[in-house]
Interface confidence: medium
């Protein structure tokens, strides 16, 4: 196989939880035998297995350059470059292969493609019916009491990745821009990565671009904010059932704490508060109806 750019398996290092730390291999590989000896099954994907007291440690020693040469991994995540993908495979002791050069993107409609693997690029389907044209991924709900364009966009599974949009608002993720665009039935573009600042002139937003481009969520792109980027979230233990009122409970490996990923329109530590600043909608059969 090709060597990752900027370093191969076993040449310098950092692992989850911060620079220089290691994964406990015994947690990642369920072994039938209690004998804890480093062998070729203990530590795969370029990691170096080390015996450490009672357990085994899998050191993922990859020195990756930070050039943005994005690749799409078989897990659906975008990596800053191929080395980061290989490092992630080592860290999680899971096979991740490059399915394409370039970033992954999520497209819920396959357009003219028949199979899941075909994709279709990003075919835009605008539906016309009693509602008139429903744009920006809205669908016409002719069964609703008030016929209108409804938005079935669920942004609850997206990580925190704030962007500044052409309407002058900050959104916690590009998905929320898409949702707002759908609900308002108007074009809202991503202006730049990060929250809008005082220097963002609202009159200029959506016009000539200043070159600050939105980039897709990049997995394993830095050692900061590992909880967001590396995907080291695990399902919460059963004793935390009901911990998140309107959201998903996630147990963060590096901090050993539970956190809530709130559904759209909710906020608070347990997703217990309604956040009216996000959406102004009328519920209609569990769908969001554009008012």
């Amino acid at each position: 196989s090709n060597q990752p750019p900027g370093g191969g398996g076993g040449s310098g290092g950092d692992c989850p939880g911060g620079k220089g730390k290691s994964i406990n291999c015994s947690e990642l590989n369920v072994r039938e035998s209690d004998v804890r000896v480093c062998d070729e099954s203990s530590c795969k994907y370029g990691g170096v297995c080390k015996e450490d007291g009672d357990g085994l440690k899998c050191a993922c020693q990859f020195q990756c350059h930070t050039n943005y040469i994005p690749v799409c991994g078989s897990n659906g995540d975008t990596y800053q470059n191929e080395c980061f993908l290989r490092r992630a495979a080592c860290k999680h002791q899971k096979e991740i292969t490059v399915i394409a050069r370039g970033p992954c993107y999520s497209d819920n409609g396959s357009g003219s493609g028949e199979g899941e693997e075909e994709g279709s690029g990003a075919e835009v389907h605008r539906k016309h019916s009693k509602c008139g044209p429903c744009k920006y991924k809205a669908e016409c709900d002719e069964d609703a009491e008030n016929v209108g364009c409804v938005c079935n966009i669920d942004c609850s599974g997206y990580s925190f990745n704030p962007v500044c949009a052409s309407d002058g608002s900050s959104y916690n993720n590009p998905c929320f821009v898409r949702e707002a665009s759908c609900i308002k039935q108007e074009q809202i573009d991503i202006r730049h990565l990060g929250h809008c600042t005082d220097t963002d002139d609202t009159s200029l937003l959506g016009k000539k671009d200043d070159g600050l481009q939105y980039r897709p969520d990049v997995k394993d792109a830095s050692d900061q904010r590992e909880d967001v980027y590396i995907g080291n979230h695990m399902p919460c233990p059963e004793n935390l059932n009901g911990y998140c009122i309107h959201g998903k409970c996630e147990f963060i490996y590096s901090t050993q704490k539970a956190s809530c990923r709130c559904e759209s329109g909710y906020t608070g530590q347990h997703c217990e508060k309604t956040d009216f600043s996000i959406l102004y909608v009328v519920p209609s059969r569990q769908k969001l109806t554009h008012v």
Partner: antibody, heavy 122, light 112 residues
């Protein structure tokens, strides 16, 4: 690295059928790519004709759809273009290209053949 | 179909100088997940097109960093920080948001 090579007759009679083949080397036609045909009339710009996936799924340019058939032959690792009822306006350099895209990724038309000139004349 | 319009159609430039080519689409190329489905291609005289930029701003493999793509929605620009001899040719933008994929009419970058 995938390489593409177009082949076919350089001269076609008006009202006849233009037939071209694109041989894929250095990779499999069964990979997650779409295989395209693009043409360029003399001194003009590029026009996308259509594309095929190894499963046989096709997308065609509506302006040519009634006359175009694109097919794939996995055993020979090649795909083909047929354009019927040709006129002088179909005289062009015909390129085959591959577009890397799928449901979760996009990379563009990263590899092109060198092109083959087809003249429609009696 | 989405119509792509490039300007200028001809751009005389001196090697070593910067160059900028504009591309406009008849509808937004911003996909719902934040990507602009806009590519740039260069066709040198007597050659087939070569791939430069994808998704609006990402350089293809092997493309020098003097090339950059900016813009979002309907307005895009290809910038060359310092034009070199090998950069001359016809530049095309192409939208890949909605089939049929459509190209701009081309901008000829020529030696001044």
């Amino acid at each position: 690295q995938v390489q593409l090579q177009e082949s076919g007759p350089g001269l076609v009679k008006p009202s006849g059928t233009l037939s071209l083949t694109c041989a894929v080397s250095g990779g499999s036609i069964s990979s997650s790519n779409w295989w395209s045909w693009v043409r360029q009339p003399p001194g003009k710009g590029l026009e996308w004709i259509g594309e095929i996936y190894h499963s046989g799924s096709t997308n065609y340019n509506p302006s040519l759809k009634s006359r175009v058939t694109i097919s794939v032959d996995k055993s020979k690792n090649q795909f083909s273009l047929k354009l019927s009822s040709v006129t002088a306006a179909d005289t062009a350099v015909y390129y085959c290209a591959t577009m890397v895209r799928g449901r979760y990724y996009y990379y563009g038309m990263d590899v092109w053949g060198q092109g083959t000139t087809v003249t429609v004349s009696s | 179909d989405i119509v792509m319009t490039q300007s200028p159609l001809s751009l005389p430039v001196t090697p070593g100088e910067p160059a900028s080519i504009s591309c406009r689409s008849s509808q937004s190329l911003l996909h719902s997940d934040g990507y602009n489905f806009l590519d740039w291609y260069l066709q040198k005289p007597g050659q087939s097109p070569q791939f430069l930029i994808y998704l609006g701003s990402n350089r293809a493999s092997g493309v020098p960093d003097r090339f950059s793509g900016v813009g979002s929605g309907t307005d895009f620009t290809l910038q060359i920080s310092r034009v070199e001899a090998e950069d001359f040719g016809v530049y095309y933008c192409m939208q890949a948001l909605q089939a049929p994929w459509t190209f701009g009419q081309g901008t000829k970058l020529e030696i001044k």
